[in-house]
């Protein structure tokens, strides 16, 4: 298809040829093309391309362009040729090639498809059935990421209230670039009656750590010492903790943000692998104090999406005064 756009027309360069589009994995869309026929011999060919909404303009010498995109909507790429990297140079007539999502009734597609990466060890996805689906629909979730050779089918389908879901192992690998990539997700039904739904989950977002585990509470003078086990798999610069202390007598509710802290005081069991410690000042030892802790990822490691871990199990120390 030619986009005969006055702004884009140039007399010198013919359009690219054989522009085609294909899908790899679940959501990797690839366009390829051939150089224009009859290009000027003194022209060092560059290709100008952008998506249908004039987004992501690119000028490059390669005769291919790819994008990772959930194929829930039609997506088009326009490509032209030119003789320099100059964005102000008008490229040839732009050629356009589009790819449409799989066919099906849009009302049958699942909705609210979202995934959470739990403790960098498994991913749990959930969705709601589409409006035009039968209650006995059997769903299948497929997933792919860079460390997999092929698309995998998720085996652990479950139901929680109105939501359906599936979880699969996804362990952070040591490769430093692992988290720069995404997981591609597709949900459809076994019978092929519903329109497939796609999602792309960046591995830098929607990370939910496991809750910490409180190991020990102790008093020293009027200070309360709290020791806990950190969730596995995270490096210390990527987490912080919220320690909540409730006092039964004063009915106060104190919240402290805590950096992962070494257990250096003699009150703590020292040098225990993967534990953190914190001293809560000014706590009354002769009253009942209940502590719980939760943890959150640092925005500089994982994009902020407001996901705290669940709270740890509570632990109490001190004695509850009899009300007289």
């Amino acid at each position: 298809d030619y986009k005969d756009d006055d702004e884009s027309r140039t007399e010198t360069q013919p359009p690219v040829t054989n522009l085609s589009v294909s899908v790899e994995n679940l959501c990797t869309v690839i366009w390829t093309w051939n150089p224009p026929e009859g290009a000027s011999s003194n022209c060092s060919l560059w290709y100008f391309s952008h998506f249908g909404d004039k987004q992501d303009k690119k000028i490059a010498p390669e005769t291919r362009r790819s994008i990772e995109v959930p194929l829930n909507e039609r997506i088009c790429l326009q490509v032209g040729s030119q003789c320099s990297t100059n964005e102000s140079e008008k490229p040839s007539i732009l050629v356009e090639k589009c790819i449409s999502p799989p066919e099906g009734d849009p009302e049958s597609a699942v909705t609210e498809l979202q995934c959470i990466w739990h403790n960098l060890s498994y991913m749990k996805c959930s969705w709601l059935p589409g409006r035009n689906t039968s209650p006995d629909t059997n769903y299948t979730l497929y997933y792919w990421h860079r460390s997999l050779e092929k698309i995998h089918q998720c085996e652990n389908i479950f139901r929680e209230g109105q939501y359906f879901g599936c979880s699969f192992d996804l362990t952070k690998v040591k490769d430093s670039s692992f988290e720069q990539h995404s997981v591609q997700i597709m949900v459809k039904d076994n019978a092929g009656k519903i329109k497939p739904s796609f999602n792309i989950v960046p591995l830098t977002s929607r990370v939910k750590p496991d809750p910490p585990h409180i190991k020990n509470l102790s008093f020293h003078n009027d200070d309360l010492y709290v020791q806990w086990e950190n969730p596995q798999n995270f490096i210390s610069r990527c987490l912080f903790y919220e320690v909540e202390v409730n006092n039964s007598q004063t009915e106060t509710h104190n919240v402290f943000y805590v950096q992962e802290a070494k257990c250096e005081n003699p009150e703590f069991e020292r040098n225990v692998e993967n534990t953190s410690c914190f001293m809560v000042p000014g706590v009354l030892p002769d009253t009942l104090n209940t502590v719980r802790i939760r943890v959150k990822t640092n925005k500089l490691c994982y994009e902020d999406d407001k996901l705290w871990s669940n709270w740890s199990q509570e632990m109490s120390i001190g004695k509850k005064r009899n009300s007289t």
């Epitope: 210390s236 610069r237 990527c238 943000y257 950096q259 925005k299 500089l300 902020d304």
Partner: antibody, heavy 118, light 104 residues
Framework: EVQLVQSGAEVKKPGESLKISCKGS????????IGWVRQMPGKGLEWMGV????????RYSPSFQGQVTISADKSISTAYLQWSSLKASDTAMYYC???????????WGQGTLVTVSS | EIVLTQSPGTLSLSPGERATLSCRAS???????LAWYQQKPGQAPRLLIY???SRATGIPDRFSGSGSGTDFTLTISRLEPEDFAVYYC?????FGQGTKVEIK
């Protein structure tokens, strides 16, 4: 007591290089981020970037990426901010500050005034 | 990129009055990451509030922070002479442009 002590004021010419420092004490230097904040004369605060001295992982604000380099030497508990070629527009007060993982700056250095003028 | 907009630009009040400073984010942010600072002329900024509502060490209880989502507030319940300064909100890589609290 947590302290961040910065190197003294600098007067430089455009095109010259510069490295200013920030020495931390009174806490575990490798367990907190160190950030750099610019304040141009009569203006507000600008977040430049941060470094985690424990593993030298750095993050820059897009506005400062490629313009400055942040580094740290954990053996002497010191962080650095450097320029390879100064411009007149780099004239400003530069603060270092300690940053816990929740992103606020809880302790600040006294500031280093950098003046770039021909 | 998130933009933090502070209002008003300048607040003219008398000692003993209540000051209410606003910080609005261009998109919803986690309150865990919202901080407030005070800066006096010729001095480094000082952290007042972190996590939107937790007072930093040594900060008097006349300073309080609240809010969630896109709207955050710093309140100074009774202005003392030493509170007249510029106040900034911050969320990781972004600072607001500042609110100057001056003596009326």
């Amino acid at each position: 007591e947590v302290q961040l002590v910065q190197s003294g004021a600098e007067v430089k010419k455009p095109g010259e290089s510069l490295k200013i420092s920030c020495k931390g004490s009174g806490y575990s230097f490798t367990s907190y981020w160190i950030g750099w904040v610019r304040q141009m004369p009569g203006k507000g605060l600008e977040w430049m970037g941060v470094i985690y001295p424990g593993d030298s992982y750095t993050r820059y604000s897009p506005s400062f990426q490629g313009q400055v380099t942040i580094s740290a030497d954990k053996s002497i508990s010191t962080a650095y901010l450097q320029w390879s070629s100064l411009k007149a527009s780099d004239t400003a007060m530069y603060y270092c500050a300690r940053m816990p993982n929740w992103g606020s700056f809880d302790y600040w250095g006294q500031g280093t005034l950098v003046t770039v003028s021909s | 990129e998130i933009v933090l907009t502070q209002s008003p630009g300048t607040l003219s009040l008398s000692p003993g009055e209540r000051a209410t400073l606003s910080c609005r984010a261009s998109q919803s942010i986690s309150s865990s990451y919202l901080a407030w600072y005070q800066q006096k002329p010729g001095q480094a900024p000082r952290l007042l509030i972190y996590g939107a509502s937790s007072r930093a060490t040594g900060i008097p209880d006349r300073f309080s922070g609240s809010g969630s989502g896109t709207d955050f507030t710093l309140t100074i319940s009774r202005l003392e002479p030493e509170d007249f300064a510029v106040y900034y909100c911050q969320q990781y890589e972004t600072f607001g442009q500042g609110t100057k609290v001056e003596i009326k």
